[in-house]
Interface confidence: low
């Protein structure tokens, strides 16, 4: 359905509050370095313009596309060339090339200072003084640091952020009420950002066929009672929503997401028995709830898959008639029977099945050729099962911090060329899989672990793409989306790597170590550990453990000393010398 004015259409559909929030997010994700006040000014100008179009859709410029309107607005920023360099060249292009150009300049690792949380009283005063500005600042700060954050979901986070302050700034103990809520929002926000980044990478690097396959598998696990046609409809709609959001079309994305939530709630009976409690909630909460809904129970009477996909003489005929539909049905049928498998494993099985049919349907006796295809899935299934088992055992044995350290060593040996901050960030997040997944029952471990690892490894791929340093990382990231994790798992010590020269400065520490939070201390120690492995890639576990134990003892000793800085100055060189000797 075409509208005379797209901007008026979206303003009316979304309402002023959501419209303004989404435009602010869009601008902040594109121009990540611009000051808050500049963005607020631009958003207000766009909003005033939208209102004139609502009043008269035939008014001047109201017929322009949203990309044209928003792009023209972004290109009015006076300091574009000084602040963004070559991104300013985007403004010389016409749509749609201009928007593509802006998208290509989104920075996954912007050079922005870490967000510092002010005192609770300071935050509560700011909240009460100007609630609207306070919440806009939240949207702006999150969006510019996470340029692919799922915009309608960010509005939901902002609503929760507002609710936390509204409740806790009235409480007797404001800090006890507020801080845990803010910690939870921060952690959930980082996780949400990383999950969305994988969806966008899947669409942008591997195409919508890859995303649709992922969605078929995931939705079939969630809605095993739904018919294939119903799942296909949801997949088509979901793909449109995420394509729009990943492409910077945030108003369309939010609007279509609301339509999808409405459709799901109107058709619960043919989708899932678990949707009811979501559908009673207001829009933002409803969409979030539907996205996170637990798997419905599997129908009790599902027949064996073998009849249709192995034993039938019509397999090749059905495959030839509509390859993607037949493979989609196979994936749907397999996924709805296996909530205990990771989505990535299900996609590997579908790929394997496709490869077998491609080969066997050209053979003299196709049926004989593909008769044992399900047996051949076994190694693909066992590989992630064994990986989860081994790593959960290691996690239970070591605890989270030491498990992270084991992964730091493992991944630094695999890809020592990768920057130390990236190795620390990625390995720490890989290590969080233990606490997140290992406590779950057996049937939930693999989907939790492998699909979480896919999200974390995508972060490595995204950061590495910005500054490529390792052919191995490029290969694992680009060859196959579904085999990324097995590809990284298969990497061993990089024998070609020339060890990094020892730099005493890297291992020089000061009294500021003592005032760091526990997490910050861990990051410092883990940074040192990565540097040690880069210096001595063939160091044994025992050698590295010895050095790290010495490090902990050295820091503890100096932090207890009266003159801490003098202690670090005196003990530091001793620690360095002892470490070099231990690793010789």
């Amino acid at each position: 359905d075409t509208h005379k004015s797209e901007v008026a259409h979206r303003f009316k559909d979304l309402g002023e509050e959501h419209f303004k929030g989404l435009v602010l997010v869009a601008f902040s994700q594109y121009l990540q370095q611009c000051p808050f006040e500049e963005h607020v000014k631009l958003v207000n100008e766009v909003t005033e313009f939208a209102k004139t179009c609502v009043a008269d859709e035939s008014a001047e410029n109201c017929d322009k596309s949203l990309h044209t309107l928003f792009g023209d607005k972004l290109c009015t920023v006076a300091t574009l060339r000084e602040t963004y360099g070559e991104m300013a060249d985007c403004c010389a292009k016409q749509e749609p090339e201009r928007n593509e150009c802006f998208l290509q300049h989104k920075d996954d690792n912007p050079n922005l200072p870490p967000l510092v949380r002010p005192e609770v009283d300071v935050m509560c005063t700011a909240f009460h003084d100007n609630e609207a500005t306070f919440l806009k600042k939240y949207l702006y700060e999150v969006a510019r640091r996470h340029p692919y954050f799922y915009a309608p979901e960010l509005l939901f986070f902002a609503a929760r952020y507002k609710a936390a302050f509204a409740e806790c700034c009235q409480a007797a103990d404001k800090a006890a009420c507020l801080l845990p809520k803010l910690d939870e929002l921060r952690d959930e926000g980082k996780a949400s950002s990383a999950k969305q980044r994988l969806k966008c990478a899947s669409l942008q690097k591997f195409g919508d066929r890859a995303f649709k396959a992922w969605a078929v598998a995931r939705l079939s696990q969630k809605f095993p009672k739904a018919e294939f046609a119903e799942v296909s409809k949801l997949v088509t709609d979901l793909t449109k929503v995420h394509t729009e959001c990943c492409h910077g079309d945030l108003l369309e994305c939010a609007d279509d997401r609301a339509d999808l939530a409405k459709y799901m709630c109107e058709n619960q009976d043919s989708i899932s028995s678990k949707l009811k409690e979501c559908c009673d909630k207001p829009l933002l909460e409803k969409s979030h709830c539907l996205a996170e809904v637990e798997n419905d129970e599997m129908p009790a009477d599902l027949p064996s898959l073998a009849a249709d996909y192995v034993e039938s003489k019509d397999v090749c005929k059905n495959y030839a008639e509509a390859k993607d539909v037949f493979l989609g049905m196979f994936l749907y049928e397999y996924a709805r029977r296996h909530p205990d498998y990771s989505v990535m494993l299900l996609l590997r099985l579908a790929k394997a099945y496709e490869a077998t049919l491609e080969k066997c349907c050209a053979a003299a006796d196709p049926h004989e050729c593909y008769a044992k295809v399900f047996d051949e899935f076994q190694p693909l299934v066992e590989e992630p099962q064994n990986l989860v088992k081994q790593n959960c055992e290691l996690f239970e044995q070591l605890g989270e911090y030491k498990f992270q350290n084991a992964l730091l060593v493992r991944y630094t040996k695999k890809v020592p060329q990768v920057s130390t901050p990236t190795l620390v960030e990625v390995s720490r997040n890989l290590g969080k899989v233990g606490a997140k997944c290992c406590k779950l029952p057996e049937a939930k471990r693999m989907p939790c672990a492998e699909d979480y690892l896919s999200v974390v490894l995508n972060r490595l791929c995204v950061l590495h793409e910005k500054t490529p340093v390792s052919e191995k990382v490029t290969k694992c990231c680009t060859e196959s989306l579904v085999n990324r994790r097995p590809c990284f798992s298969a990497l061993e010590l990089d024998e070609a790597y020339v060890p990094k020269a020892f730099n005493a400065e890297t291992f020089t520490f000061h009294a500021d170590m003592c005032t760091l939070s526990e997490k910050e201390k861990q990051v410092k120690k883990q940074t040192a550990l990565v540097e040690l492995v880069k210096h001595k890639p063939k160091a044994t576990k025992e050698q590295l453990k010895g050095v790290m134990d010495n490090f902990a003892a050295f820091v503890e000793k100096c932090c207890k000393a009266d003159d801490k800085e003098a202690c670090f100055a005196e003990e530091g060189p001793k620690f360095v010398a002892a470490s070099q000797a231990a690793l010789a």
Epitope: R348, E376, P379, E479, P486, C487, E492
Partner: nanobody, 123 residues
Framework: EVQLLESGGGLVQPGGSLRLSCAAS????????IGWFRQAPGKEREGVSC????????NYADSVKGRFTISRDNSKNTVYLQMNSLKPEDTAVYYC????????????????WGQGTQVTVSS
């Protein structure tokens, strides 16, 4: 029963060529990376070449680069190692091995092994 069977070995003069085959039975090679290894008398088994399950990724030991070529024909469930410009130091028993999806850089990373085929380069 899962089996890998090497063939194509033999006696060849320096500068000559051989084509080794690794045929799988009991499972489909589509889902496996295949590595070729060799072991000379009194020496460690060493990696020669490997091809990932997709066929898109191959790697070679420095000592054979430019002389050996690995390829696969999934329709025949077979992987080949074309060996040209053979040298006496290529003399060894050649083994093929399979690992799920991706090449490994260590011997213990492989799940299935063949029995080996002898290659002798001598004048």
């Amino acid at each position: 029963e899962v089996q890998l069977l090497e063939s194509g070995g033999g006696l060849v003069q320096p500068g000559g060529s051989l084509r080794l085959s690794c045929a799988a039975s009991g499972f489909t090679l589509d889902y496996y990376a295949i590595g070729w290894f060799r072991q000379a008398p009194g020496k460690e088994r060493e990696g020669v070449s490997c091809i990932a399950s997709s066929g898109g990724s191959t790697n070679y030991a420095d000592s054979v680069k430019g002389r050996f070529t690995i390829s696969r024909d999934n329709s025949k469930n077979t992987v080949y190692l074309q060996m040209n410009s053979l040298k006496p130091e290529d003399t060894a028993v050649y083994y093929c091995a399979a690992a799920v999806l991706e090449c490994r850089t260590v011997v213990r990373g492989y799940d299935y092994w063949g029995q080996g085929t002898q290659v002798t380069v001598s004048s």
